[in-house]
C-alpha cells in the first residue's frame, strides 16, 4: 500500500498505527513531539521499505531504537529534502542507536544527527555505504563515542561477523547495533544490490532484493517502477510521478494539490506528472494538461479580495511577488521606508496589467514611478469618483513618471488627475497624456499647472560632455561651463555614476525620497577661473567596467515665469581600460601518467578585460622524504598527515590542550592559538547550526487545525 | 463564517434536466476550488464534478460526463450543475463543497477530505 502525502505523527505515539499497512510513504515521515515515554516494542512496521522524501524525529521520548519499528526500510529517496537533509535525528533524548539495519540507500540529501545525548554506534556506520557523498553529513553534539563503547556483534568473543570498512583512516567493524551487522554487498555487484544470500540483484533494483537478477523481485526501484516492475524510463502514455513511479494519463487529470484551496490540476510536461508547468511555461488554455513555453514572463493572476490593494510597506509589495495581472486597484501610499525603490520594484516590477484605477498619494518616498517598469495597461474597469483611473495627489519628491522614451503605457478607460506634487514638472504630466492616449479626456482642473512642478527645474538645458579620458581604475571628463541668466544663480556641480553593464539605465533608478540611491554623487565646485571647464577624477572604479555618468548643475531655485531654470547632462557610458586579471582559480593537477600531469583550472573572477590566454609554468620539485619514513609492508597503520578543519564539537572539548613535541627541541609546547580562520569557522559553524534550529522550528511548530 | 446554500432539487423524469445552485458567503469566492458530491440512499457519499477558480478547469466523474456541466459565475458567488439526461440511479442528495488546504502533496479531486466546506444538500429525485 502506498501512503502519503506525508504522514505527521505528533503528539500521540498510537498515531504510528497510521504506518500499519504501509509498503511505501509517498512524501515525508515525522515522528516528533511525543514527550510522555512510551513503550514502543508493541509496535512494529515491516511492510514499510522505502520512504520517497525524508525521515524526521524530534524529540521523541522513550524511543531506544528505530530497528523495531521500522526493521524493513530500505531507501530513503529524498526527492525532497528537509533542509538539503533526507534523514534527521534532532534531540531524540532516549535514542540509544539508529539500528536501520536494512536501510541500504539514501538517494539524494545527506543526513543530520544533532544532539542525541544518549546515542551511539554512530562510528560504527559507515554512511559511503548508503549516501554518494558523506561530506554533507552533519554528525554532531551526541554521545562521545569514548563514552559508547560500541561493539559490533561477535567481537567479544573474538568471532567478529561483521565486514570491515575503512572511516577516516580506520579500518573497522561496521554495524547498527550489537546484535545487526552493516549489510555489504560482494564487490563483483560492483554498484548493484544484492540480496541476503549476497546475490546481485538486477540493476533496477536499489537497496536489496529478494530474487537475484530479477527486475520484479526489487526491494525499492533505481529509477521507476512500473506495474510491478523496475524501470529505467516509464513506457509511452505513462509519466513520472513524485520521482519514483509511472502514472497514466487518467490518474493525473484527476488529481489535484492539497496544499492549495484552488482546483488547478496537475499538468504533464516532459514527461512528467507534475504540480505545475516549470518555470518559463504556462498551461495550454483552461482545460489543457499540457504546457506551452510562455511569450516573455509568464502571467500569473493576482486578485485582492478588498479590491483595492493598498501598498504602504515592502510587506505589502510582497504580496505582489511575481504578479503580471493584479485583478483590483492599486493605492500606492509609501510614506518612508530603506531601499523602497528597489524593493518595490522587486516585488512589483512583473506587473504588466492592472484591471481598475491607480492611485498614488502621499507618497514622499517616492522620486520616480518606475519601480512598475512592466506596467503596460490600467483597463479603468472600476474608476475613482470623477472617473478617474489614474490619480498622483500630494507626493512631495515625485519627480517622474516613467521615463516616455521607453515605456508604452495605455489606460483604457477613465482621466487622469494630478495636483499637489511640486518636483513633478507638468511636461512630464503631458508626455503622460500623449503616450497613454488620455489627451482630451481630462477637464481643465485634472491636471494643476500652479502646484505640479512649482518647486521644481522644469526648464532644463542641457550639459556637454567636452572631454573624457581614462585607464583601469579612473574616468576624467569635462563639461561645457553652464551660464545661466544670472551666474550667481549656479552654486555647484554633481556628478552621478555607478556601473551600468548595459545601456538601459535612467536617472531615477533605485532612487528614492529616503536616502536610497543606486548613484554614487560626487559634488564638484565651479572652476574659480570663468574660462577652465569644469571637470572631475572619479578614481577607486574597476578596471574594464562600463559605468553611466552625469552631470547636473546645482543651481538657486531661481524662479522665471513660475519656472526654475536648471541643466543637466544626458547620461554618458564609457568603459575603464583593461588591467592584469586576478589569479585563476582551484588549480588542481593530477598525474595519469608517469610522465604527464593534467592541469585544470576556473577562470579568474575578475578578468579585467577580455582573456586571451593563460601562462602555466611548471618546475621540478625534490621527492618529499616524509614518503620514504614508512615501511609500506608493514601491519602497522601507515601514519596519516592530520590538518585542522577548523571545527570542533565543544562538547567534547574536555581535556587540557595536548601538548606536543614541538620543533628540534625535547620540550613540550602550549597548543596553538585559535587562528582567525578557525575562530571564524567556529562561528560560521554555530551560526549554520541556529539557522537549521529555526528552520526545524517553523517547520513543525503549526497552528492546531480548526 | 461560510455559508453555502444549494437549491434547485426536486423530482423529474428521466431524460429530464435540473439546473442546481450552491451560493457562498463568508469567503472569497473566487480564489476556491469547488465541486458537487451526491450521496444515494445507503451509498458512499461520491463526487460527481468539480471546477477551479482560477482557469475554470473542470472535472467529471465517469458515470455523468456528457450530461452534466459544472460552471461558476464569481460576480455572484454562485456554482451551478446544469443535468441532463436525468437517470433514475443520479437520485441522490446532492451537495455542494469548497476546497480548503489539506496539508501536503495530493488527492484526488472526488476525495471528501480535500474539502473544507459543505452545504446541507438539495434532493434530487428521478422517477417516472
Known amino acids: 500500500e502506498i501512503c502519503g502525502p506525508g504522514i505527521d505523527i505528533r503528539n500521540d505515539y498510537q498515531q504510528l498505527k497510521r504506518l500499519e499497512n504501509c509498503t511505501v510513504i509517498e512524501g515525508y515521515l515525522h515522528i516528533l513531539l511525543i514527550s510522555k515515554a512510551e513503550d514502543y516494542r508493541s509496535y512494529r512496521f515491516p511492510k514499510l521499505t522505502v520512504i520517497t522524501e525524508y525521515l524526521l524525529l524530534f524529540r521523541v521520548a522513550g524511543l531506544e531504537s528505530l530497528g523495531d519499528l521500522f526493521p524493513n526500510l530500505t531507501v530513503i529517496r529524498g526527492w525532497k529534502l528537509f533542509y538539503n537533509y533526507a534523514l534527521v535525528i534532532f534531540e531524540m533524548t532516549n535514542l540509544k542507536d539508529i539500528g536501520l539495519y536494512n536501510l541500504r540507500n539514501i538517494t539524494r540529501g545527506a543526513i543530520r544527527i544533532e544532539k542525541n545525548a544518549d546515542l551511539c554506534y554512530l562510528s560504527t556506520v559507515d554512511w559511503s555505504l548508503i549516501l554518494d557523498a558523506v561530506s554533507n553529513n552533519y554528525i554532531v553534539g551526541n554521545k562521545p563515542p569514548k563514552e559508547c563503547g560500541d561493539l559490533c556483534p561477535g567481537t567479544m568473543e573474538e568471532k567478529p561477523m561483521c565486514e570491515k570498512t575503512t572511516i577516516n583512516n580506520e579500518y573497522n567493524y561496521r554495524c547498527w547495533t550489537t546484535n545487526r551487522c552493516q549489510k555489504m554487498c560482494p564487490s563483483t555487484c560492483g554498484k548493484r544490490a544484492c540480496t541476503e544470500n549476497n546475490e546481485c540483484c538486477h540493476p533496477e533494483c536499489l537497496g536489496s532484493c529478494s530474487a537475484p537478477d530479477n527486475d520484479t523481485a526489487c526491494v525499492a526501484c533505481r529509477h521507476y517502477y512500473y506495474a510491478g516492475v523496475c524501470v529505467p524510463a516509464c513506457p509511452p502514455n505513462t509519466y513520472r510521478f513524485e520521482g519514483w513511479r509511472c502514472v497514466d494519463r487518467d490518474f493525473c487529470a484527476n488529481i489535484l494539490s492539497a496544499e492549495s484551496s484552488d482546483s488547478e490540476g496537475f499538468v504533464i510536461h516532459d514527461g512528467e506528472c507534475m504540480q505545475e508547468c516549470p518555470s518559463g511555461f504556462i498551461r495550454n488554455g483552461s482545460q489543457s494538461m499540457y504546457c506551452i513555453p510562455c511569450e516573455g514572463p509568464c502571467p500569473k493572476v493576482c486578485e485582492e479580495e478588498k479590491k483595492t490593494k493598498t501598498i504602504d510597506s515592502v510587506t505589502s509589495a510582497q504580496m505582489l511577488q511575481g504578479c503580471t495581472i493584479f485583478k483590483g486597484n492599486l493605492l500606492i501610499n509609501i510614506r518612508r521606508g530603506n531601499n523602497i525603490a528597489s524593493e518595490l520594484e522587486n516585488f512589483m516590477g512583473l506587473i504588466e496589467v492592472v484591471t481598475g484605477y491607480v492611485k498614488i498619494r502621499h507618497s514622499h518616498a517616492l522620486v520616480s514611478l518606475s519601480f512598475l517598469k512592466n506596467l503596460r495597461l490600467i483597463l479603468g474597469e472600476e474608476q475613482l469618483e470623477g472617473n478617474y483611473s489614474f490619480y498622483v495627489l500630494d507626493n512631495q519628491n515625485l519627480q517622474q513618471l516613467w521615463d516616455w522614451d521607453h515605456r508604452n503605457l495605455t489606460i483604457k478607460a477613465g482621466k487622469m488627475y494630478f495636483a499637489f506634487n511640486p518636483k513633478l514638472c507638468v511636461s512630464e504630466i503631458y508626455r503622460m497624456e500623449e503616450v497613454t492616449g488620455t489627451k482630451g479626456r481630462q477637464s481643465k482642473g485634472d491636471i494643476n499647472t500652479r502646484n505640479n512642478g512649482e518647486r521644481a527645474s522644469c526648464e532644463s538645458d542641457v550639459l556637454h560632455f567636452t572631454s573624457t579620458t581614462t585607464s583601469k581604475n579612473r574616468i576624467i571628463i569635462t563639461w561645457h561651463r553652464y551660464r545661466p541668466p544670472d551666474y550667481r544663480d549656479l552654486i555647484s556641480f554633481t556628478v552621478y555614476y555607478k556601473e551600468a553593464p548595459f545601456k538601459n539605465v535612467t536617472e531615477y533608478d533605485g532612487q528614492d525620497a529616503c536616502g536610497s540611491n543606486s548613484w554614487n554623487m560626487v559634488d564638484v565646485d565651479l572652476p574659480p577661473n570663468k574660462d577652465v571647464e569644469p571637470g572631475i577624477l572619479l578614481h577607486g572604479l574597476k578596471p574594464w567596467t562600463q559605468y553611466a555618468v552625469y552631470v547636473k548643475a546645482v543651481t538657486l531655485t531661481m524662479v522665471e515665469n513660475d519656472h526654475i531654470r536648471g541643466a543637466k547632462s544626458e547620461i554618458l557610458y564609457i568603459r575603464t581600460n583593461a588591467s592584469v586579471p586576478s589569479i585563476p582559480l582551484d588549480v588542481l593537477s593530477a598525474s595519469n601518467s608517469s610522465s604527464q600531469l593534467i592541469v585544470k583550472w576556473n577562470p579568474p573572477s575578475l578578468p579585467n578585460g577580455n582573456l586571451s590566454y593563460y601562462i602555466v609554468r611548471w618546475q621540478r620539485q625534490p621527492q618529499d622524504g616524509y614518503l620514504y619514513r614508512h615501511n609500506y609492508c608493514s601491519k602497522d597503520k601507515i601514519p596519516i598527515r592530520k590538518y585542522a578543519d577548523g571545527t570542533i564539537d565543544i562538547e567534547e572539548v574536555t581535556e587540557n590542550p595536548k601538548t606536543e613535541v614541538c620543533g628540534g627541541e625535547k620540550g613540550p609546547c602550549c597548543a596553538c592559538p585559535k587562528t582567525e580562520a578557525e575562530k571564524q569557522a567556529e562561528k560560521e559553524e554555530a551560526e549554520y547550526r541556529k539557522v537549521f534550529e529555526n528552520f526545524l522550528h517553523n517547520s513543525i511548530f503549526v497552528p492546531r487545525p480548526e | 463564517e461560510v455559508q453555502l446554500v444549494e437549491s434547485g432539487g426536486g423530482l423529474v423524469q428521466p431524460g429530464g434536466s435540473l439546473r442546481l445552485s450552491c451560493t457562498a458567503s463568508?469567503?472569497?469566492?473566487?480564489?476556491?476550488?469547488m465541486a458537487w458530491f451526491r450521496q444515494a440512499p445507503g451509498k458512499e457519499r461520491e463526487g460527481v464534478s468539480a471546477?477551479?477558480?482560477?482557469?475554470?478547469?473542470?472535472y467529471y466523474a465517469d458515470s455523468v460526463k456528457g450530461r452534466f456541466t459544472i460552471s461558476r459565475d464569481n460576480a455572484k458567488n454562485t456554482l451551478y450543475l446544469q443535468m441532463n439526461s436525468l437517470r433514475a440511479e443520479d437520485t441522490a442528495v446532492y451537495y455542494c463543497?469548497?476546497?480548503?488546504?489539506?496539508?501536503?502533496?495530493?488527492?484526488?479531486?472526488?476525495?471528501?477530505?480535500?474539502?473544507?466546506?459543505w452545504g446541507q444538500g438539495t434532493l434530487v429525485t428521478v422517477s417516472s
Open positions: 463568508g469567503l472569497t469566492f473566487g480564489t476556491f476550488g
Open positions: 463543497a469548497v476546497r480548503s488546504k489539506n496539508g501536503a502533496g495530493y488527492g484526488f479531486w472526488y476525495e471528501a477530505r480535500l474539502y473544507g466546506y
Open positions: 471546477i477551479s477558480a482560477s482557469s475554470g478547469r473542470t
